[in-house]
């Protein structure tokens, strides 16, 4: 996988006027890395792993850049003509990548109320937009505004591309994203499901990178997909990930079942614990689209694009 730096900024408007704050999250190699929110942007490292490696200068620089980007995005939202009553959002996602062969890619995407309406390849400066008429109207509106804005010149887009890559290279050089491997902790629990049945849940947590195989086996043979329920692989806030898989089995047959885990070339199997059945209230609760972002997203049901 390539190394990547991803900026995700969102601004909101209510009843025709743009709100003063903005939300931003920066992901480094797919992991939450920095965060800014509300009125005052203060770039905060996401998890000890980032804080330990990078100094205050980084946060100051990113805070300055993100604040500038947030201001630009608010101005863009103010120029969108079809704003109706109620709450609206404009989201900009900017990504740059460095591949193994040292080739680079950069792109920028705009979403209005959670719907993609405009994308740009920052290297070729080529714009693309979806087919829907609403999206095209929005896209033309925003494109024209960006072109009119003296800041949004050819050099500006080149600078966005170059700056993103410069930051990414700086982070890579710092060693914050060494291609490290953190093995998961695997934990198997059981809970009463219904008469004569139990639900067994296998949780893997604290692993990096995010790719993992987690499945239930009966007598050493993988259960079919339709008899298992998987949780999403989610960041746990420490630069690592967590996930789970569950299945329902007959009580008394626990010895036949094992949880199989494979991660970064290593594997393990984990039996179902015997003894007293533990009653668990629920599986991990998570919101796939929100990833623990600001409450405002949850309250307003604004979709967060990953």
């Amino acid at each position: 996988e390539p190394h990547s730096l991803r900026y995700n900024l969102t601004v909101l408007s209510g009843d025709g006027s743009v709100q003063s704050g903005f939300l931003a999250e920066v992901h480094l190699d797919g992991q939450p890395f920095l965060r800014c929110d509300r009125q005052k942007c203060r770039a905060k490292p996401q998890g000890q792993w980032a804080e330990d490696v990078l100094g205050n200068k980084t946060w100051d620089r990113e805070t300055r850049d993100l604040t500038g980007n947030g201001k630009d995005l608010r101005m863009t939202l103010a120029h969108i003509k079809d704003q109706k009553e109620g709450l609206h959002s404009l989201q900009e996602i900017r990504v740059c990548e460095i591949h193994e062969d040292n080739s680079t890619r950069s792109s920028q995407h705009f979403y209005y109320d959670g719907e993609l309406f405009l994308s740009q390849n920052l290297e070729t400066e080529e714009w693309t937009m979806p087919q829907s008429s609403r999206a095209q109207t929005l896209a033309m509106n925003v494109r024209n505004f960006l072109k009119e804005d003296a800041m949004k010149t050819k050099t500006h887009y080149h600078a966005m591309h170059a700056d993103c890559l410069q930051e990414l290279r700086r982070y890579l050089k710092s060693g914050v994203v060494l291609r490290r491997t953190v093995p998961p902790m695997v934990n198997v629990t059981r809970s009463e499901a219904s008469e004569g049945n139990i639900t067994v849940t296998c949780r893997a947590s604290g692993f990096y990178p995010w790719n993992i195989t987690l499945s239930w086996r009966q007598d050493g043979v993988s259960l079919s997909h339709d008899t298992q329920q998987w949780g999403d692989v989610l960041p746990d806030g420490n630069g690592t990930y967590q996930t789970w898989v569950a299945t329902r089995i007959c009580q008394g047959e626990e010895q036949r079942f094992t949880c199989y885990m494979e991660h970064s070339g290593n594997h393990s199997t984990h039996p179902v614990p015997s003894g007293k059945v533990l009653v668990l209230q629920s599986h991990w609760q998570h919101h796939h689209h929100h990833h623990g972002l600001n409450d405002i997203f949850e309250a307003q049901k604004i979709e967060w694009h990953e």
């Epitope: 086996r217 007598d219 050493g220 043979v221 993988s222 010895q255 036949r256 094992t258 199989y260 594997h267 393990s268 199997t269 984990h270 039996p271």
Partner: antibody, heavy 118, light 107 residues
Amino acid sequence: QVQLQQSGPELVKPGASVKVSCKASGYAFTKYNIYWVKQSHGKSLEWIGYIDPYNGGTVYNQKFKGKATLTVDKSSSTAYMHLNSLTSEDSAVYYCATTDGYSLFTYWGQGTLVTVSA
Amino acid sequence: DIQMTQTTSSLSASLGDRVTISCRASQDISNYLNWYQQKPDGTVKLLIYYTSRLHSGVPSRFSGSGSGTDYSLTISNLEQEDIATYFCQQGNTLPFTFGSGTKLEIK
């Protein structure tokens, strides 16, 4: 390719014990269970039990509990079946098998003939 | 224990014939039925798993079908190398149990 190489034939006296080995190659040994099956002369097959090489967990056919003990040596990718208190009823060909994770008894060893005779 | 019954203990057929071997379980085994081939030298190979799934490398002339308690293995075009004993086996309930085998011979 997956291979299971079993130890050679054994001639043992009644009351004695025997240890049959099954050396696995061509795959990650601790990834898949090893199963053991008995075939008495001219008869059908009987499942003895299986072992998870990763953690040593075993499941036995009730009929063979106390007769067979399954173990593994991860360092040499070898599974063992120890048979004790042998009688003529234990004379048979014993097979080890493994799985590909999708089907039982996917790959089989060549079999080990155990003869119990005074 | 679940009893697996292969009523035909031996079967004679000519090369090129279509041959069907049947197997019955004493109770519903939910399609957890596998077929194995044992050559005269004792070598055992998996042919079919989960009633009808062909194991990799097994010729397509072999097929399996069935449900509930009744299952069958079909060889569509018998070849010399198919001379062997065929066993069915259920994997639904412990202990795993095998049929008594059907020995296939050439007429």
